[in-house]
Interface confidence: medium
């Protein structure tokens, strides 16, 4: 693959959730996601998963959803191999593993749906001595974790059945998985559950089929069965009101898609703790996310995150539809093993794309909360090194918030041109407008273009063209000049805003390859997420914690929106989990001190529903990261509290967990937190890791933005996957970001091994 | 202390739907997954399918068209209902919590055999 | 569907050292540390050893280990013991679907 950069923009908040193409399975098998739903009344099982982003119906959060421990799925997402990030030992597809190699070790963190699955278990039970496989699916993790291992499996992720009742998209709207590509991050998850087929709602898309049976199942959960793959081309998401594709949007801000910005200074990924929090934070555009595919090349990325001052978060809303990446499926995945998923199971399975998705948009009255806006530029580098410039599917957003304001989301699918593996699916951009004076936060990666803050975000599609997302509603500059009138403190309530999950590139079945990144299909789309060794000089660094409400656009629960607060001011507040104490802010020199501190994240276990488990991944919209000096210490999210919410993109069902969120003594998230919140735009399944990234590259002040952070991850070998992306978890962490998916076998498997405590 | 009973019917005429619960105690079906696995006498264990902590299912795609798998939040259980039954299916049936690679505690297994 | 191929026997003295392969491919073994291993005794429902590819679960003697190489996950016991003997499972997912391997039977001699 080339090296397309991706350039995403940080933001705190977004206005909307940004839909992604459809995700498929790479596996062979597309999970159906029943879209029964569970005997139980109330919010489907999956936290954040909107049915319509993933095209597996989410199933409303259960009262009892809540997840009350993590199971060693969810510790053994946290396992993943934090090793470089190349090396998760999903990612790696012949990567060995020495016996008695720990969980971390094993590089087990990040799995696919499945995985996810299995990972809760095991988390939830360190001491039962249950392994954390869940089902074999589980990710491999602490003991117990063993089911979340299976997860991991290179097999596509299953797409976990939704529950039927859930909300369909509407035809056309869901997510479909044009290619098997999409699947990619699920094979991982097939690898630990094998082809499981989840069957979810009847998917609308083209080629979407209700899956057969199970209807009458009273399951709660979402029936979708992601163990089809799907096949169905991608919905056409309508166009912008304005008239405009969505891509032309992207286009009109004007980048230099591989530039990095202007100034950028490499930071270490903890500068971001030591970003004084003063530094406001616009809300960032809707991801403009692309992930490039590359079956064989690791992707290098290279994150400039640029911290811009005062700008309203508002301004990013605009640009929201997501640029699709397609992603090589896994070695040996490939149409082979999605032929079976082709089949009826994929046309069972097809989940419709969440091409209209929108993000609901924040009441224009509110306040638009200063948060530091961090542009983060992701470079990411086929394993050869060569980037191609050549942009495939370019999806552009409008640089303002305002022309995409009452357009409904648009998430064209477009399947990778070129690309002949099935299980590479390019994400569909999803454009969600969002009126530009909502303060709507979602955090995505957005790609700037040119000065405006719009970023173009480069993917390779597997046939080696490059897509440019488009900025998701960068403001212009002078946008975030007005931004500045309207700020509010920086500081933010401790209460946490709606999971930044929206921030995450989308994990939609666009992207076969995001899919679950731990499915075993798809090595690229397998997320790895080793924490990358910083110089043994520098301290291991806390982030400042940035949460950012992801909102989904179809669904107002999951947008679970905290009433716009003014944000305290955050000059004289400490923030203890991001230790933005060590951050020096100065004015004018924009000069920040970052103290190279590693975070130690070896210590930190995602715990349910912890964002510190979000995967982001590439291609993401901007993600806005808000450097909330949040005293989490005293704060535990309780069952329904929005730190539980997960929100999935595409079905706005918010899943509320019961799991009380300890972030006393631990900047460690817990499962259910927003931390592990992954937004994946298209209604890419969240995958929640415990890897954290530490931003090993120099930290300079970069005086426009404040900061940018330039992260390079180190080439995987053997591993395509692009999801190395890293997120700042509301602790602050960064985390880096496998785009796996809960929605997928892999993810399930992760979530069981890591509940098992894995 | 982490527990999964299955229950059902331990005979069931060919063609007809075998129906199994699983109930659990000691964790949520809510926030664990729930697999099902089968095992014919003397034979590997076969990975029917699961309902993840997200409220997906998965199925194994060669009885997907025939099983189906549902949750109860609300009583802790997890059914799994096939369909179609044949002498092949006899098996001893295990729910378990986890997915697959991770599944940590098993049920003790139900007999459930399939003869007209 | 996928397959997980296991010798189907192996057998091992007391305190010796006995390796038990499962091989996959890049779809499900080799693309990631998500195997699982599993020890069943006949009548019994299986024990989770090993899940993560080397994660030991909880509870499990250290002389277990699982590791992997390329598409084979092998499970590694050191210093057999009697009470070893029994079936071996290996399990992974892929595309969405989770499955054991062939199975191992393991004799201690």
């Known amino acids: 693959m080339a090296e397309p950069r991706q350039e995403f923009e940080v933001m705190e908040d977004h206005a909307g959730t940004y839909g992604l193409g459809d995700r498929k399975d790479q596996g062979g098998y597309t999970m159906h996601q029943d879209q029964e739903g569970d005997t139980d009344a109330g919010l489907k099982e999956s936290p954040l998963q909107t049915p319509t982003e993933d095209g597996s119906e989410e199933p409303g959060s259960e009262t009892s959803d809540a997840k009350s421990t993590p199971t060693a799925e969810d510790v053994t997402a946290p396992l993943v191999d934090e090793g470089a990030p190349g090396k998760q030992a999903a990612a790696q597809p012949h990567t060995e593993i020495p016996e008695g190699t720990t969980a971390e070790e094993a590089g087990i963190g990040d799995t696919p749906s499945l995985e996810d699955e299995a990972a809760g278990h095991v988390t939830q039970e360190p001491e039962s001595g249950k392994v954390v496989q869940e089902g074999f699916l589980r990710e491999p993790g602490p003991p117990g974790l063993s089911h979340q291992l299976m997860s991991g499996m290179p097999g596509a992720p299953l797409l976990p059945e939704g529950p039927r009742e859930a909300t369909r998209q509407p035809s056309g709207t869901g997510p479909e998985d044009t290619e098997g590509g999409r699947h990619a991050p699920e094979l991982l998850k097939h690898q630990l559950l094998g082809d499981l087929h989840q069957e979810g709602p009847p998917l609308k898309g083209a080629g979407g089929k209700e899956r057969p049976g199970s209807k009458e199942e009273v399951d709660e959960d979402r029936d979708v069965d992601e163990s089809s793959p799907q096949d169905s081309p991608p919905s056409k998401a309508s166009p912008a009101q304005d008239g405009r594709p969505p891509q032309t949007a992207a286009r009109e801000a004007t980048s230099i898609p591989g530039f990095p910005a202007e100034g950028a200074i490499p930071l270490p990924v903890d500068f971001l703790s030591k970003v004084s929090t003063e530094i406001p934070a616009s809300e960032p555009d809707g991801p403009s996310v692309g992930r490039a595919k590359g079956q064989d090349a690791p992707l290098e990325f290279t994150f400039h995150v640029e911290i811009t001052p005062n700008v309203q978060k508002e301004q990013a809303h605009s640009e929201e539809h997501l640029g699709r990446a397609a992603f090589p499926g896994a070695p040996g995945e490939g149409p082979e093993a999605r032929g079976p998923s082709l089949g009826e199971d994929t046309k069972e399975a097809d989940l419709p794309e969440p091409s209209e998705k929108q993000p609901a948009a924040a009441p224009r009255g509110k306040p638009v909360s200063r948060v530091p806006q961090l542009k983060a530029r992701m470079v990411s580098k086929s394993k050869d090194g060569t980037g191609s410039d050549d942009k495939k599917a370019k999806t552009s957003t409008r640089s303002s918030a305002k022309t995409l304001k009452n357009r409904p989301c648009l998430s064209p699918k477009h399947p990778t041109p070129g690309s002949s593996d099935p299980l590479i699916q390019p994400s569909s951009p999803a454009v969600c407008p969002e009126p530009p004076s909502s303060p709507k936060y979602v955090s995505s990666v957005t790609s700037r273009t040119g000065s405006s803050g719009a970023k173009e975000m480069k993917l390779k599609g597997a046939d080696g063209k490059t897509k440019i997302a488009t900025p998701r509603g960068a403001a212009p500059p002078g946008q975030k000049g007005q931004a500045n009138a309207t700020r509010i403190p920086a500081k933010t309530p401790p209460a946490p805003k709606t999971p930044p999950s929206s921030g995450e590139p989308p994990k939609s079945g666009d992207r076969s390859g995001y899919s679950s990144p731990g499915s075993p299909g798809t090595p690229g789309s397998r997320s790895r997420t080793p924490s990358l060794p910083t110089p043994p000089t520098r301290e291991p660094k806390k982030v400042a914690v940035v949460r950012t409400p992801p909102k989904s656009p179809s669904s107002a629960k999951s947008r679970l929106q905290t009433a716009p607060v003014p944000m305290p001011d955050l000059k004289n507040v400490k923030s203890k989990i991001g230790s933005t104490e060590n951050l020096k802010h100065q004015p004018g020199g924009g000069k920040v001190q970052i103290i190279n501190k590693k975070l130690d994240l070896s210590n930190v276990q995602s715990k349910c529903g912890s964002k510190d488990n979000i995967k982001h991944v590439p291609g993401g919209g901007s993600v806005q990261i808000v450097y909330k000096p949040v005293d989490l210490s005293k704060v535990t999210s309780k069952c329904g509290s929005l730190g539980n919410i997960h929100h999935k993109p595409g079905g706005g069902q918010v899943e509320v967990k019961s799991e009380k969120l300890d972030f006393k003594d631990r900047v460690q998230s817990k499962i259910g937190s927003l931390d592990n919140i992954t937004h994946v735009p298209g209604g890419g399944n969240k995958k929640i890791e415990t890897h954290k990234l530490t931003f090993r590259e120099n930290a300079k002040a970069k005086t426009d933005h404040g900061a940018e952070i330039v992260y390079k991850s180190p080439v995987v070998s053997g591993d395509t996957s692009p999801r190395h992306l890293s997120n700042v978890s509301s602790t602050g962490s960064i985390d880096m970001v496998d785009s796996p998916q809960l929605a997928t076998l892999a993810d399930e498997v992760s979530a069981s091994l890591a509940k098992q405590g894995l | 202390q982490v527990q999964l009973q299955e229950s059902g019917p331990s005979l069931v005429k060919p063609s007809q739907t075998l129906s199994l619960t699983c109930t659990v105690s000691?964790?949520?079906?809510?926030?664990?997954?729930v697999a099902w696995v089968r095992q014919a006498p003397g034979k590997v264990p076969e990975w029917l399918g699961a309902?993840?902590?997200?409220?997906?299912?998965y199925y194994n795609p060669a009885l997907k068209s025939r099983l189906s798998i549902t949750r109860d939040t609300s009583k802790s259980q997890v059914s799994l209902s096939l369909s179609s039954v044949t002498t092949e299916d006899t098996a001893v049936y295990y729910c378990?919590?986890?997915?697959?690679?991770?599944?940590?505690?098993w049920g003790r297994g139900l007999l459930v055999t399939v003869s007209s | 569907q996928a397959v997980l191929t296991q010798p189907s026997s192996v057998s091992g003295s007391l305190g010796q050292r006995v390796s038990i392969t499962c091989s996959g491919s890049s779809s499900n073994v080799g693309y990631g540390n998500y195997v699982g291993w599993y020890q069943q005794v006949p009548g019994s429902a299986p024990k989770l050893l090993i899940y993560g590819t080397a994660i030991r679960a909880s509870g499990v003697p250290d002389r277990f280990s699982g590791s992997r190489s390329g598409d084979t996950a092998t499970l590694t016991i050191t210093s057999l013991q009697a009470e070893d003997e029994a079936d071996y499972y290996c399990?992974?997912?892929?595309?969405?679907?989770?499955?054991f391997g062939s199975g191992t039977r393991l004799t201690v001699l």
């Open positions: 378990a919590r986890g997915i697959i690679a991770g599944v940590d505690v």
């Open positions: 309902s993840g902590s997200s409220g997906n299912k």
């Open positions: 399990a992974s997912y892929q595309s969405n679907y989770a499955f």
């Open positions: 000691g964790f949520s079906v809510i926030s664990d997954s």
